[in-house]
């Protein structure tokens, strides 16, 4: 990216960059970011009593410490380790739900099926969901004007590295049968470049995970194709099988009915396919 090239070519120290140079292509830190993180933490520990031991001020301090005063294109997973340690949480075996490009339905599902968990149902995922943040090198400021964009500026930015770190950890700790919800309306139902495809798939532990079950969510009402035969799903099956994890795939032809049947499994219409 442009700034990194400047550093390499001219060996400019980060703190020597004029303030006007630190303009990024992405939107700035979410308004009231510190207050939002702290409030979310307090709410989470109240709604999840098993996490009542968590000190939310310490969580915010660790979160802040991961990116404040650091050049926002040089963030590492190591920077987030204190936060990850404070947010350590376990999911019972068979209860992990991963998702790719279909976040809303995955979250609607776990709101009904309360014993299953996406990353955003965990403390750290809940804290950061839909937020943006970054700091500035050698100042204690949060940058509310702009933050690095993954494509246009750099991939090692505070937000991207955070999600890579917590996604890796979430996958590493999964056990039993792991489920993943995939968007059947996308050209690449399984995308190797998504967080699921690039991080989570490769960090499932074969000694703990018996199987990965993919739920391919259909978009169109009249779509009766077997999307489990899609080439990208076959690619996912190949990756998973090579890691000695069994793979299963299921078409969810009617996501609306699927959710309704999760809510009311006794409904007579739920005995037929969804």
């Amino acid at each position: 990216s442009g700034l990194n090239d400047i550093f390499e070519a001219q060996k400019i120290e980060w703190h020597e960059l004029p303030r006007w140079r630190q303009q990024w292509s992405g939107s700035g830190t979410t308004s009231r970011f510190p207050e939002t993180v702290l409030a979310r933490c307090v709410k989470y520990t109240e709604v999840h009593p098993e996490m009542r031991h968590v000190d939310c001020q310490s969580v915010w301090d660790a979160f802040k410490g991961a990116f404040i005063s650091k050049y926002p294109c040089n963030i590492t997973e190591e920077d987030y380790q204190p936060l990850v340690k404070l947010g350590t949480q376990t999911v019972p075996c068979n209860k992990t739900l991963l998702w790719s490009r279909i976040k809303d339905l995955a979250h609607q599902f776990t709101q009904v099926q309360r014993d299953m968990f996406t990353l955003e149902d965990m403390l750290l995922g809940y804290l950061a969901d839909d937020l943006t943040w970054c700091g500035e090198f050698n100042t204690f400021e949060i940058n509310y004007q702009s933050c690095p964009d993954w494509r246009k500026d750099c991939s090692n930015n505070p937000v991207s590295v955070f999600w890579k770190t917590v996604s890796r950890r979430f996958a590493e700790t999964a056990c039993g049968v792991v489920h993943v919800m995939l968007n059947g309306s996308r050209s690449k139902i399984f995308d190797k470049n998504s967080t699921f495809g690039s991080v989570e798939v490769h960090n499932l532990q074969p000694e703990k995970v018996q199987a990965l079950e993919a739920w391919v969510i259909h978009g169109g009402r009249e779509d009766s194709r077997d999307l489990c035969q899609d080439p990208t799903i076959k690619e996912l099956e190949s990756i998973i099988s090579k890691r000695n994890i069994r793979f299963f795939c299921k078409n969810i032809y009617r996501p609306d009915k699927f959710l309704q049947c999760v809510k009311n499994p006794e409904d007579s219409s739920c005995l037929s396919g969804i």
């Epitope: 999840h48 009593p49 098993e50 031991h53 949480q89 376990t90 019972p92 209860k95 309360r114 014993d115």
Partner: antibody, heavy 114, light 113 residues
Framework: QSVEESGGRLVTPGTPLTLTCTAS????????MSWVRQAPGKGLEWIGF?????ITYYASWARGRFTISKTSTAVDLKITSPTTEDTATYFC???????????WGPGTLVTVSS | AQVLTQTPSSVSAAVGGTVTINCQAS????????LSWFQQKSGQPPKLLIY???SLASGVPSRFSGSGSGTQFTLTISGVQSDDAASYYC?????????????FGGGTEVVVK
């Protein structure tokens, strides 16, 4: 630091009863508080608890039969429609970070009989 | 619903002997270690002995120890004293959104001869 239960007495079946747990030496806004009961000669049974911000959680068997609420100085347990099976000593306990109770009251006896 | 099964229901021990009480959960407790042990003497409220499987509560003698993980847990009293005659209860913690937050075992009565 201590907790103490009060309000236990003899009631007839179906007559609502409210027990109160009063805390001394610590703030109820800083702790979850739990209710546990013990029928004569039997084991401990967790009823439910109330969070720092008054979110309540109940054992599956206790839902609808009990209501937990709090003020700044006390935590109440309402037995909505007592039956003879609700005869027990009712304990209030402070819930700490890693267990169901690091501080318990002496208990208050509720007898349900016609 | 989750169940915690304590064995034995009653045990007799000589002063100076060792007592072992088992607690088996029907599903893993939260974080595989969120299990506590309580002691209750007749006419008194329960007293916390051990939390998080093996951590000794404040003021509890070191002859009490806990071990285990997941669904299988043990309370051991080494060098039993007459003062240890009481009922002992295990208590497991689970994720509240999908289960009862806390569940007690049925209890074990320890008689000291």
């Amino acid at each position: 630091q201590s907790v103490e239960e009060s309000g236990g007495r003899l009631v007839t079946p179906g007559t609502p009863l409210t027990l109160t747990c009063t805390a001394s030496g610590f703030s109820l806004s800083s702790y979850y508080m739990s209710w546990v009961r013990q029928a004569p000669g039997k084991g401990l049974e967790w009823i439910g608890f109330i969070s720092k911000t008054a979110i309540t959680y109940y054992a599956s068997w206790a839902r609808g039969r009990f209501t937990i609420s709090k003020t700044s100085t006390a935590v109440d347990l309402k037995i909505t429609s007592p039956t003879t099976e609700d005869t027990a000593t009712y304990f209030c306990a402070r819930v700490d970070a890693y267990s169901a109770g690091d501080l318990w009251g002496p208990g208050t006896l509720v007898t349900v009989s016609s | 619903a989750q169940v915690l099964t304590q064995t034995p229901s009653s045990v007799s021990a000589a002063v100076g002997g060792t007592v072992t009480i088992n607690c088996q959960a029907s599903q893993s407790v939260y974080s595989d270690n969120r299990l506590s042990w309580f002691q209750q003497k007749s006419g008194q409220p329960p007293k916390l002995l051990i939390y998080s499987t093996s951590s000794l509560a404040s003021g509890v003698p070191s002859r009490f120890s806990g071990s285990g993980s997941g669904t299988q847990f043990t309370l051991t009293i080494s060098g039993v004293q007459s003062d240890d005659a009481a009922s002992y209860y295990c208590q497991g913690e689970f994720i509240c959104t999908s289960a009862d937050c806390f569940v007690f075992g049925g209890g074990t009565e320890v008689v000291v001869k």
